[in-house]
Amino acid sequence: AFGISGVQKYTRALHDSSITGISPITEYLASLSTYNDQSITFALEDESYEIYVEDLKKDEKKDKVLLSYYESQHPSNESGDGVDGKMLMVTLSPTKDFWLHANNKEHSVELHKCEKPLPDQAFFVLHNMHSNCVSFECKTDPGVFIGVKDNHLALIKVDSSENLCTENILFKLSET
């Protein structure tokens, strides 16, 4: 089990951390949905894409993302979502060669085609929250999380640890 800790506890660790090696410690294929059970879906072409937050039809298959889990090298003494004092980070890929990226200037979540090693913008600290929910905090901008805004994904600033449980930054992972 992972604990919940305040956003600010991660600030130094995030800025100082680097990803151990180039290989993830594990990978997991899962559908991504919001706290309110709307699905995250992707419409992706070579030169364009859309990311939707929507209700799916009964017969429609859910889109899946490949979550690759990495440990950061920075050992943290604070209680956090880590293993053996290390933070757990993830990258999210809906298909081969494409990854979710944080665009902190535009406060947007984008899909980029890129080669490994991935840039820091593709890494998110994984927080395990209540009710089997998770949240994704930008490695490049501590305190900023992937969230839902106007039926799209966006980057949302969370000012205090109390707001870590706000519904619009909570997501559910499911194998189905």
């Epitope: 992707f42 070579d46 429609e60 298909t95 081969k96 060669d97």
Partner: antibody, heavy 128, light 106 residues
Framework: EVQLLESGGGLVQPGGSLRLSCAAS????????MSWVRQAPGKGLEWVSA??????????YYADSVKGRFTISRDNSKNTLYLQMNSLRAEDTAVYYC????????WGGGLRYPFGYWGQGTMVTVSS | SYVLTQPPSVSVSPGQTASITCSGE??????AAWYQQKPGQSPVLVIY???KRPSGIPERFSGSNSGNTATLTISGTQAMDEADYYC?????????FGGGTKVTVL
């Protein structure tokens, strides 16, 4: 610009074989599921076969009417889709279209997207 | 196997609205796509996911889908809209087309 160019059609006797090709350009061929759709003269569209993109392992799918006789395949290095047609019957006479999914196939996505791009078709006539 | 049923023909006067139906069991639980095909040409996608239009398709084309019926609506029909129209869904990894509807602009 997305382009799909079919070739390989022609006249063949019942029981014979043909291999259709679809040369693709203007997009990352390996990322998309591809299909063959046919249209008999004066008739409607009929889905024939499809093959996944590399997001879903390149698995083939077939309509019941061609299962066991037709084989779909792809060569991603050549950006080419194929349809090997054996034991051809008169009812296989049709224009055969190559079609690309509207979007890139996602991990484990299966077949679910519409056909966003179509080739011009190649005519296959099965007759003695 | 899954069956989609369309009316063979629909006639409409220029400027009027043409509605083409596509019926199938629990159709509303699936996403419907619509294709336009003019004589001697390849099909063109005009509606996908029930209601969405690809870029380049005029706004007069719209779609809906609920219950057992999907509908393609052409508002302010023009002479250039005269064509065959096909609905399509995926059912258990099998592509299924309707029989097609010939739209005649009188």
């Amino acid at each position: 610009e997305v382009q799909l160019l079919e070739s390989g059609g022609g006249l063949v006797q019942p029981g014979g074989s043909l291999r259709l090709s679809c040369a693709a350009s203007g997009f990352t061929f390996s990322s998309y599921a591809m299909s063959w759709v046919r249209q008999a003269p004066g008739k409607g569209l009929e889905w024939v076969s499809a093959i996944n993109g590399d997001g879903d392992g390149g698995r083939p799918y077939y309509a019941d009417s061609v299962k066991g006789r037709f084989t779909i395949s792809r060569d991603n290095s050549k950006n080419t889709l194929y349809l090997q047609m054996n034991s051809l019957r008169a009812e296989d006479t049709a224009v055969y279209y190559c079609a690309r999914d509207l979007w890139i196939q996602l991990w484990g996505g299966g077949l679910r997207y519409p056909f966003g791009y179509w080739g011009q078709g190649t005519m296959v006539t099965v007759s003695s | 196997s899954y069956v989609l049923t369309q009316p063979p023909s629909v006639s409409v006067s220029p400027g009027q609205t043409a509605s083409i139906t596509c019926s199938g069991e629990r159709m509303g639980d699936k996403y419907a796509a619509w294709y336009q095909q003019k004589p001697g040409q390849s099909p063109v996608l005009v509606i996908y996911q029930d209601t969405k239009r690809p870029s380049g398709i005029p706004e007069r084309f719209s779609g809906s889908n609920s219950g057992n019926t999907a509908t393609l609506t052409i508002s302010g029909t023009q002479a250039m809209d005269e064509a065959d129209y096909y609905c399509q869904v995926w059912d258990s990894s099998t592509g299924v087309f309707g029989g097609g509807t010939k739209v005649t602009v009188l």
